[in-house]
């Protein structure tokens, strides 16, 4: 059985068949005698009960409210009520793009790695008994595939496979022809297998500081999800109350890798913080990479070539 419509906010395209199915369907069958009502409210209108007489486009079956088709003026809040059970949905009907075979706002994006298995299957379980034929389009050009009931692509992805794939189901209802479109934006990316993690910036950094002031040493890396980045300083991390490792921030890159940043904060810099190594390490199964920071007094800057300084 088709699962119920649990999402409270739904966006659909005008002119397509659409349905809402409430989530206490099994319960409704048990209580056949119980009054079950569907309501709509929008703008000034408060809770108008829906029935087939209210619109020739609306049909009610057991647990389902059907639209044949849904139109812009169907936008609003819908309620199903049965005894003390209520379910609510907010429906937003958007305009169809007349200049394309799909509407951009109703596209599902998928990322597929090159050479990995790539599949698109056109199926629609709710309307399947009514569907006469289904076509699959790539960038709005029809693909010639054998199966015109459930056209399918199954292959290892290539970069040329990138594009917009639209499944269009054609169906008849009460003598009228309708179509339902489902579009996928397929992006083909480089192989996401593990990279060798790399720390960004020079391996040795001399940082000019003043005694009594604070400094933040930022260590950034490009790494894999399970790699780690950490600071090493002194004999035992945590022994110096003026040194703090801030929380690591890790953000996914568009390629599916991770950009990590971890700051070491040294407060009230003292003599003991000068000319010692503060090491930042990134570690992975494939090994480690380390970069070092050395704090030097501003007055001593002249002794070190300018290009090795970081600010």
């Amino acid at each position: 059985a088709e699962s119920c419509t649990s999402r409270p906010h739904i966006t659909v395209v005008e002119g397509e068949p659409f349905y809402l199915k409430h989530c206490s369907c099994s319960l409704a069958h048990e209580i056949e005698t119980t009054t079950k009502s569907w309501y709509k409210s929008s703008g000034s209108q408060e809770h108008v009960e829906l029935n087939p007489r209210s619109s020739s486009r609306i049909a009610l079956h057991d647990c389902v409210l059907e639209f044949w088709p849904v139109e812009l003026n169907d936008t609003g809040s819908y309620f199903f009520q049965m005894k003390n059970y209520t379910q609510k949905w907010k429906l937003n009907v958007i305009r169809r793009n007349k200049h394309s075979c799909f509407t951009e706002r109703q596209v599902t994006s998928k990322i597929v790695e090159v050479k990995k298995f790539f599949q698109i299957t056109c199926e629609n379980s709710y309307y399947q008994t009514l569907v006469n034929s289904t076509s699959l389009y790539k960038n709005c050009k029809k693909l010639l595939l054998e199966n015109n009931k459930n056209p399918t692509i199954k292959k290892n992805a290539e970069f040329e496979d990138q594009g917009y794939y639209s499944c269009v189901h054609f169906l008849h209802h009460n003598g009228k022809l309708f179509n339902i479109t489902k579009t996928f934006n397929i992006t083909i990316v480089e192989d996401r297998s593990n990279i060798v993690p790399v720390l960004l910036g020079p391996k040795l950094n001399h940082v000019a500081v003043e005694l009594g002031k604070n400094v933040r040493l930022n260590c950034s890396a490009l790494l894999n999800e399970e790699d780690v980045i950490y600071w090493m300083f002194g004999e035992e991390n945590g022994s110096d109350p003026n040194i703090h490792e801030e929380k690591e921030m890790r953000i996914m890159t568009p390629e599916g890798k991770w950009h990590a940043s971890k700051v070491l904060r040294i407060e009230n810099i003292g003599e003991s913080n000068l000319n010692v190594l503060y090491n930042c390490t990134v570690a992975s199964t494939g090994g480690t990479d380390t970069k070092s920071f050395i704090l030097v007094r501003k007055a001593d800057m002249a002794d070190i070539p300018g290009h090795v300084f970081t600010r």
Epitope: E226, M232, G238, K247, E248, M252, A283
Partner: antibody
């Protein structure tokens, strides 16, 4: 799913040692640190220490320094906490928790790995 | 070590009430503070990190605020499942330290 499973309850005599284990599953063990926290009966939470699973570095609470040792076995994804010279006031429930000060942003909802997953607790009773 | 002082140590409230728990640090800890919920016989559960960030999966009725030395955990509308003990934790430096806890009981 991600979980930490701790060893069973222990009853020890004063002066003895106890070693509690914490087995991780559902995630890459040596990508996250492990903290140990204890709770005496009817009392609050007390942080005992933290170990970086990926390099063995440790930080211990001052009051336990010299009596506590935290170790890991990455081959079995298990962390251990050993407490020596037990006293009656060491009677408590001992918890391990995954603990890495890492905020991960993938999509819309950030997720924080600092003490985000806990073991079920191990009761250690010290009594003569 | 940084001392964390929580208040009140206990409070009685009804379902639907707005509840506020405070935590004070003995020194500036920026925003390096977390809040945990613990129910009897269970392990603690992380609610808030970095003083005001809601951990993924935690209901939005929980919120945290503050920075420096003074922090607050607020439950906007207390639910039956929220009756528990709440702890703050500073993760600014080592040793980590917890507040002594606030028990939220049914009025």
């Amino acid at each position: 799913q991600v979980q930490l499973v701790q060893s069973g309850a222990e009853v020890k005599k004063p002066g003895a040692s106890v070693k509690v284990s914490c087995k991780a599953s559902g995630y890459t063990f040596n990508s996250y640190g492990i903290s140990w926290v204890r709770q005496a009966p009817g009392q609050g939470l007390e942080w005992m220490g933290w170990i970086r699973t990926y390099n063995g570095n440790t930080n211990y609470a001052q009051k336990l320094q010299g009596r506590v040792t935290m170790t890991t076995d990455t081959s079995t994804s298990t962390a251990y906490m050993e407490l020596r010279s037990l006293r009656s006031d060491d009677t408590a429930v001992y918890y391990c928790a995954r603990d890495e000060a890492r905020i991960v942003v993938a999509g819309t909802t950030p997720y924080y790995y600092g003490m985000d997953v806990w073991g079920q607790g191990t009761t250690v009773t010290v009594s003569s | 070590a940084i001392q964390m002082t929580q208040s009140p140590s206990s409070l009685s409230a009804s379902v639907g009430d707005r509840v506020t728990i405070t935590c004070r640090a003995s020194q500036d800890i920026r925003n390096d503070l977390g809040w945990f919920q613990q129910k009897p016989g269970k392990a603690p559960k992380l609610l808030i990190y970095a003083a005001s960030s809601l951990q993924s999966g935690v209901p939005s009725r929980f919120s945290g605020s503050g920075s420096g030395t003074d922090f607050t955990l607020t439950i906007s509308s207390l639910q039956p499942e929220d009756f528990a003990t709440y702890y703050c934790l500073q993760d600014y430096n080592y040793p980590r330290t917890f507040g002594q806890g606030t028990k939220v009981e049914i009025k």
